[in-house]
């Protein structure tokens, strides 16, 4: 039996700059029941607070609701592990909520096969920003990527689309079914997970015009 091993803060993420969650990896438990607590202070302030909500985001996590989230403050976060033999603390993590945003994926992914006047066909991919994103006010600006592949293929083809919420993909194989996904990233922050797949079959012959 021994004191607990040092826990490690795995990551902190915010979906929208309004709330955030931090997750940690427990260290070894020293063969004894071990309690974990997350404490934090805000840069420039002396007061230390304990995690307001250990339940919402699941095991080994702390959820900060709107009430506890400030975007102009740096949080100094530590996880403490305690058992009967002693305690240990993680290295502190400095968190600026502006820089930890991982949004929900884009939505309303639509796929349309189109044809240019020269008979060249292309796939027109369109989508909308994630629901929580207030793009117009500048609170968020998102950059996007799409990826697609033939249904049977292993490797995805990725296209960066900047701030555009549409993209034309040329040179696709007729008769082939393609899977398409999109994801987004705020100016400061992390890529969202990929959206659900949408699929489209490229026609063998195509007679419609734009």
């Amino acid at each position: 039996q021994s004191p607990p091993g040092k826990p490690e803060i795995h990551k902190c993420r915010s979906p929208d700059k309004e709330t955030f969650t931090c997750w940690w990896n427990p260290g070894t438990d020293g063969g004894l029941p071990t309690n974990y607590s997350l404490t934090y202070s805000k840069e420039g302030e002396k007061t230390t607070y304990e995690c307001p909500d250990y339940k919402t985001s699941g095991p080994n996590s702390c959820f900060f609701s709107k009430q506890y989230t400030s975007i102009w403050k740096i949080y100094i976060i530590t996880v403490n592990a305690t058992n009967q033999m002693g305690s240990s603390s993680s290295d502190p993590l400095y968190v600026d909520v502006t820089y930890i945003v991982e949004p929900e994926p884009p939505r309303n992914l639509t796929l349309e096969v189109k044809q240019l006047k020269d008979k060249k066909t292309y796939l027109w991919v369109k989508w909308s920003p994630p629901t929580i994103t207030d793009v117009k006010t500048g609170w968020f600006t998102m950059e996007y990527e799409i990826r697609l592949k033939p249904e049977e293929a292993e490797e995805w083809e990725i296209h960066f689309t900047g701030h555009q919420t549409q993209f034309k993909v040329f040179d696709l194989y007729p008769g082939q079914k393609y899977l398409v996904q999109t994801r987004c990233k705020p100016d400061h922050g992390y890529w969202s997970r990929w959206s659900q797949e949408s699929s489209v079959e490229m026609p063998n012959d195509f007679t419609l015009k734009d």
Epitope: V135, E143, E145, I158, F160, G162, H163, F167, D187
Partner: antibody, heavy 120, light 107 residues
């Protein structure tokens, strides 16, 4: 005919700021990205950043993030780049360029360039 | 950031000759490569994008090739107006970066 008309040459003092304009015509301004590119005398090209007028979204080269600010005025189809805290390293020709309407990063039409000279 | 290495730095050739300029990306950029021509005192002009697609109005003696990390620009039957500087640029994802340029001079 697509045209990008940039403002005239600037002679500015170290520490000052300069705001360069790029007036677009001949296409729907909000449908295309506007990029800004720096070319120091006799040197290669450096991408500064871009702005998408449709939603004011910007992307910057980290090197220029604290040096340049990109904005647009959609009512006049004009893009602007402000360069601040100027030093002799900022003396260069600055170009605005239109991004291809589909692929973000290739630039199909260019302004004539604005020469900025920083000197006391 | 993705580095673009262009070669040669300079090149002398005669009217009517064929020349090839190469560009190497420090990582896979698929086909996201553009080529520009620049004349003294003028802005660059787009020649090729997506590695091999000729921009509008560009003569067919220009051709682009390659994918992944290795790319080339070939100019067949050089004309007097082809002399100047050439730059490659990746347009895969931000930050977009340019090669250091190739100066093509008349022999």
């Amino acid at each position: 005919e697509v045209q990008l008309q940039q403002s005239g040459p600037e002679l500015v003092k170290p520490g000052a700021s300069v705001k360069i304009s790029c007036k677009a015509s001949g296409y729907t301004f909000t449908d295309y990205n506007i990029h800004w590119v720096k070319q120091s005398h006799g040197k290669s090209l450096e991408w500064i950043g871009y702005i998408y007028p449709n939603n004011d979204g910007t992307g910057y080269n980290q090197k220029f993030k604290s040096k340049a600010t990109l904005t647009v005025d959609n009512s006049s189809s004009t893009a602007y780049m402000e360069v601040r805290s100027l030093t002799s390293e900022d003396s260069a020709v600055y170009y605005c360029a239109r991004g291809d309407g589909n692929y973000v990063g290739d630039m199909d039409y260019w302004g004539q360039g604005t020469s900025v000279t920083v000197s006391s | 950031d993705i580095q673009m290495t262009q070669s040669p730095a300079s090149l002398s050739a005669s009217v009517g000759e064929t020349v090839t300029i190469t560009c190497r990306a420090s990582e896979n950029i698929y086909s996201y490569l553009a080529w520009y021509q620049q004349k003294q005192g003028k802005p660059p002009q787009l020649l090729v994008y997506n590695a091999k697609t000729l921009a509008e109005g560009v003569p067919s003696r220009f051709s682009g090739g390659g994918s992944g990390t290795q790319f080339s620009l070939k100019i067949n039957s050089l004309q007097p107006e082809d002399f100047g500087s050439y730059y490659c640029q990746h347009h895969y994802a931000t930050p977009f970066t340019f090669g250091s340029g190739t100066k093509l001079e008349i022999k």
